[in-house]
Amino acid sequence: SITGISPITESLASLSTYNDQSITFALEDESYEIYVEDLKKDKKKDKVLLSYYESQHPSSESGDGVDGKMLMVTLSPTKDFWLQANNKEHSVELHKCEKPLPDQAFFVLHNRSFNCVSFECKTDPGVFIGVKDNHLALIKVDYSENLGSENILFKLSE
């Protein structure tokens, strides 16, 4: 459960891949599309509002206890729109929604090496936002093997 309905802090940052491709957002036919692309030098990077929430991490073995605390984020590139996990389609989409936000808009934030982070679906543990064919997608990760996979690593820069 998320401890409070209001975030503990917020920040604006641009989002890029491990390989320094930018995550950009474009309004097309009244809906937003998400792109992973090399930006031209003079083009300004899109910013995302990251809202951080403190959350309880349930004990994964007993299932009834609290294992500790974790940090969750929501990502909003423009007013009233949030990144959401579509677990059925294994896709990441931008949806207009009102607060309280649905669980699909929350991602566990993982601190990784090389100054990178990863975003794990709150609604589907072990599934992360990743890059597939120049788009964002949901990627299942085996903890014991692929946690360092470059396609789920992202950089946040102010």
């Epitope: 920040s11 940052a13 073995e61 566990v108 934030l109 601190n111 990784r112 093997e145 946690l147």
Partner: antibody, heavy 119, light 111 residues
Amino acid sequence: DVNLVESGGGSVKPGGSLKLSCVASGFTFSSFSMSWVRQTPEKRLEWVATISGGKTFTDYVDSVKGRFTISRDDAKNTLYLQMSSLESEDTAMYYCTRANYGNWFFEVWGAGTTVAVSS
Amino acid sequence: DIVLTQSPGFLVVSLGQRATISCRASESVAKYGLSLLNWFQQKPGQPPKLLIFAASNRGSGVPARFSGSGSGTDFSLNIHPMEEDDTAMYFCQQSKEVPFTFGSGTKLEIK
């Protein structure tokens, strides 16, 4: 209950070796980043080494690089610290620690095991 | 390396009063908009215990009388009202970057 139990400490002469172990229980070990933190006799705390979940990354404090090796066996729920070329400055209580889920801070600590390096 | 300077080194506070411990970092410990500064309590013969993470968030089971504040380079831990059980050593620690570093500690006692 989440639990970390260290063992393997003892007295050793300078230049000697020791291998510390930490057995974890009560959580899915492979999902968490694990670290060793030591506390000197003067009560100073010093981070020693970290290994990520999935064994992908390791990091060390400069003073132990090339002498200490952190490793894990997820099948045995065990964290290790192989220490060689020990120096008197390595004398400390060694704590096994588990990061929180997401790897932002040291959330769980074991009771510690004592290492004494003296001639 | 980021150096954390804690003050005071020793603090005596009466029961029911406020204890304030400061921690100053040699450079900002902010990353991704988060202040990556944590506080630990250590009682004699025990390992450190997480009190506060990310500057102001209580760890699991930590009483509300413990609170953290600050940003950038200046942080503080407040304990109010002080209870007998709060007699301990307190350490700040940064998790912004390797090597993770700790403050030198503050010994807190009851008057």
